[in-house]
């Protein structure tokens, strides 16, 4: 690595992956192992993030970019940058202080993480329950009870024609 001869800051020419070494007359020195500099002109290299235990390495640290961690199988990330790993549960369960517990009647969870949420109350929208809810799935709401009363037409109007090349939303 050449010593820079810039008239301004002699460190400004040190590229990413190096640091401006004050102990060596401001020579651009490569980042030591387990460290990186993602921008030029740095006076130190940053330590790489360590992925250990319940974390696994998603992306190795290089001289110019930090490591990235995610969680080992059976766990999922919480917090920005995957700062914590939390145990997965099955669909139809939620994680409590006592471990994975089935959703109470009237609630569901369709993911391996998060909490059980109440089934949709169809009647609030003036609709009826078309498909019952389960621990894993929300109820499916259908037409309002009035729409299904005797004499009411169950024929739906034809869908408007779509322009070619447009996919349904």
């Amino acid at each position: 690595f050449e010593r820079t001869r810039s008239l301004q800051d002699p460190c400004s020419n040190c590229p990413a992956g190096t640091f401006c070494d004050n102990n060596r007359n401001q020579i651009c020195s490569p980042c030591p192992p387990n460290s990186f500099s993602s921008a030029g002109g740095q006076r130190t290299c940053d330590i790489c993030r360590q992925c250990k235990g319940v974390f696994r390495t998603r992306k190795e640290c290089s001289s110019t970019s930090n490591a990235e961690c995610d969680c080992t199988p059976g766990f999922h990330c919480l917090g920005a940058g995957c700062s914590m790993c939390e145990q997965d549960c099955k669909q139809g369960q939620e994680l409590t202080k006592k471990g994975c517990k089935d959703c109470c009647f009237g609630t569901f969870n369709d993911q391996k993480r998060g909490i059980c949420r109440p089934w949709t109350n169809c009647s609030l929208d003036g609709k009826s329950v078309l498909v019952n809810g389960t621990k894993e799935r929300d109820v499916v709401c259908g037409p309002s009870p009035a729409d299904l009363s005797p004499g009411a037409s169950s024929v739906t109007p034809p869908a408007p024609a779509r322009e070619p090349g447009h996919s349904p939303q």
Epitope: T44, D46, I47, C48, R49, Q50, K52, G53, V54, F55, N66, T72, G74, F75, L78, G79, A80, G81, C82, S83, M84, C85, E86, Q87, K98, G99
Partner: antibody, heavy 116, light 107 residues
Framework: QVQLVQSGAEVKKPGASVKVSCKAS????????INWVRQATGQGLEWMGW????????GYAQKFQGRVTMTRNTSISTAYMELSSLRSEDTAVYYC?????????WGQGTLVTVSS | DIQMTQSPSSLSASVGDRVTITCRAS??????LNWYQQKPGKAPKLLIY???SLQSGVPSRFSGSGSGTDFTLTISSLQPEDFATYYC?????????FGPGTKVDIK
Amino acid sequence: QVQLVQSGAEVKKPGASVKVSCKASGYTFTSYDINWVRQATGQGLEWMGWMNPNSGNTGYAQKFQGRVTMTRNTSISTAYMELSSLRSEDTAVYYCARETGPFDYWGQGTLVTVSS
Amino acid sequence: DIQMTQSPSSLSASVGDRVTITCRASQRINNYLNWYQQKPGKAPKLLIYGASSLQSGVPSRFSGSGSGTDFTLTISSLQPEDFATYYCQQSYSTPFTFGPGTKVDIK
């Protein structure tokens, strides 16, 4: 629920060794690293090292290198921390903690007194 | 090794006060910063992880912010049970290190 239960208080003579245990329950012991942290009376928290219960791999703070050994017995979901060549400055409460990134569960602490 | 500093080392406050504690890392640790509360004779308790995420079961009056090297723990309205010592800790890279602590006592 998740619990880390540590062994009882110990009184040791200078130069002796102490082995503190930490029994885990309420989760899969081999899934998370166990860390050890100590605290002298009226002082702050001092990180000592970690142990991976699955592999047995360890990492120690430089200050304790050569004096500390962290081990485990997976069949009884228990981690151990042994500190040798004890001196009076090692008098402290020793904690084990589960690492999920942060330390989300801690043992109740074990007081180790080093006195002649 | 990454050094952690905290300020102030102690503070006196009254119930209902807004309390702010700062923590600084000697190098960038992104958001891998955790806050713990410790009461005399008890083990530390996790309050905040990932600089700003509230641990399950912790009251919402506790909040955390910051990224890089500078971080803050805020208690929006101090309650009697909040008088304790607070520690920051980096979980970015071993050796994991703690700040020296901030003792919050009654004015």
